[in-house]
């Protein structure tokens, strides 16, 4: 007989076909994989299943974010008897199947990593044909993307009473420490805002009052490197404007 397990959110977890002694459904994924932005990562995933010598059609799927409902980033299908899993979906063309699903391996290569790829990924296999069955990893593998700092924005903005303030926003993982230097400043950590919700890798530092003309430099640093950018403040004395 066939038993279908359902979790509390009514998502199909897996279907177990009970027959003569056989392996149960299971998936082996590491809790976390780390890689640098711009490089490639491998998300390992192997599985066991109770259907001995299954040779029918199969589909391999990887999702991001959450199991069962998260968006698919990769999907391939292998016809009956075929060792080749033909890619049907590869988000931005950066996901490539390394493993052979016929040999219980769904491992995936992710190319040209970006900080936005830092999330959890879930592998899933579906059997169709004589046997209808599927299984998906519940906990998934966390892809931790590290990156040297990059200053994404630096600007001078007007403040009340004809004053000016400077803002510097940088990204990186680990989140970079920001420091301002400039006329009569020495080295100042300034007012560093915590990473914003949904922008976990962005850090902003503000210089609330620019008191002198000249060059102001923002430096972002973490364990992987450092980056700096500058802005120039030149006020037209006797006028209310500034050139930056």
């Amino acid at each position: 007989f066939v038993r279908t397990k359902i979790d509390t959110t009514e998502n199909l977890l897996n279907t177990e076909v009970h027959s003569s002694p056989a392996q149960r459904w299971s998936m082996q994924v590491p809790p976390e994989v780390s890689a640098e932005a711009g490089d490639a990562a491998v998300l390992p995933c192997t599985f066991t299943h109770p259907h001995r010598h299954y040779d029918g059609p199969l589909t391999a799927i990887w999702r991001a974010g959450e199991p069962y409902a998260g968006p698919q980033v990769f999907r391939c299908a292998a016809a009956r008897g075929s060792e080749l899993c033909q890619t049907a979906l590869s988000l931005h063309g950066r996901f490539r199947l390394l493993g052979n699903p016929r040999r219980n391996d769904l491992s995936l290569r992710v190319e040209r990593l970006a900080l936005a790829d830092d999330r959890r990924y879930f592998c899933r296999v579906e059997f169709a044909g004589d046997v209808h069955d599927r299984y998906e990893s519940r906990h998934g593998v966390r892809l931790h993307v590290t990156a040297a700092p990059r200053i994404v924005n630096i600007s001078v903005l007007p403040s009340p009473a004809h004053a000016f303030r400077a803002l510097c926003t940088a990204e990186g993982e680990p989140p970079p420490a920001l420091a301002w230097s400039g006329p009569a400043l020495g080295n100042s950590l300034a007012a560093v805002r915590s990473p914003r919700e949904g922008h976990g890798h962005l850090v902003t530092a503000e210089l609330p009052a620019l008191t002198h003309d000249g060059r102001y430099t923002c430096t972002a640093a973490n364990s992987l490197g450092r980056s700096e950018a500058s802005v120039y403040l030149f006020r037209f004395h006797g006028a209310s404007g500034a050139s930056t």
């Epitope: 590491p30 994989v33 890689a35 490089d39 490639a40 990562a41 491998v42 998300l43 390992p44 080749l84 033909q86 890619t87 049907a88 979906l89 590869s90 063309g93 490539r96 199947l97 390394l98 493993g99 491992s107 290569r109």
Partner: antibody, heavy 121, light 111 residues
């Protein structure tokens, strides 16, 4: 049986152009990435260019030594791979092989017999 | 660019002997246990033929006397007992990072 047959090689003067072709048969051409790999006389192998398939937006990749001079393309309807070679130099003299790779691995599981390109005045 | 180096340049052995060929990468070519190293055989006047992919997987139709091992930067191709048809040139290649690069090759010749 997988077959890759190159053509279009020959003698060309420095600065000249040549277009190589590779006719593929015995497999579903659309499912694979295709490559050109070259071998200078008596030397080792050098990967030249790769073109991916439709799912991978026909993305192209080149070795630094040929970037801007060579263009890889494919015609899925004709099961054919091409290499347009411009501004040829003496150091481009080699046997050019057409090679297939799976979408998951940048290794070359089938190769053609090659076509010789000689750049000389 | 990852630089690939093979040693020795030439290996002189007799049929029936064991051949051990080395391949070294200038930086690690292994990610999460997957090693992006592949081995090819080439005979004079012929195209290369894939022997081993991803360090240790035997390509289709290749005899079991060929095996591959290694991780990180150091890899080995072993031919357990040389057959007359095994005397040829052998290349390793990395696909860890583009551009994909080959080593200069090892020639296995009859002693």
């Amino acid at each position: 049986e997988v077959q890759l047959v190159e053509s279009g090689g020959g003698l060309v003067q420095p600065g000249g152009s040549l277009r190589l072709s590779c006719a593929a048969s015995g497999f579903n051409f659309n499912d694979y990435f295709m490559n050109w790999v070259r071998q200078a006389p008596g030397k080792g192998l050098e990967w030249v260019a790769q073109i991916r398939n439709k799912i991978y937006t026909y993305a192209t990749f080149y070795a630094a030594s040929v970037k801007g001079r060579f263009t890889i393309s494919r015609d899925n309807a004709k099961n054919s791979l091409y290499l347009q070679m411009n501004s040829l130099r003496a150091e481009d003299t080699a046997v050019y092989y057409c090679a297939r790779s799976l979408t998951g691995g940048d290794y070359f599981d089938y190769w053609g017999q090659g076509t010789l390109v000689t750049v000389s005045s | 660019e990852i630089l690939m180096t093979q040693s020795p340049a030439t290996l002189s052995l007799s049929p029936g002997e064991r051949a051990t060929l080395s391949c070294r990468a200038s930086q690690s070519v292994t990610i999460s246990g997957y090693s992006f190293i592949h081995w090819y055989q080439q005979k004079p006047g012929q195209a290369p033929r894939l022997l081993i992919y991803r360090a240790s997987n035997l390509a289709s139709g290749i005899p079991a006397r060929f095996s591959g091992s290694g991780s990180g930067t150091d890899f080995t191709l072993t031919i357990s007992s040389l057959e007359p048809e095994d005397f040829a040139l052998y290349f390793c290649q990395q696909s860890r990072k583009s551009p994909w690069t080959f080593a200069q090759g090892t020639k296995v010749e009859i002693k």
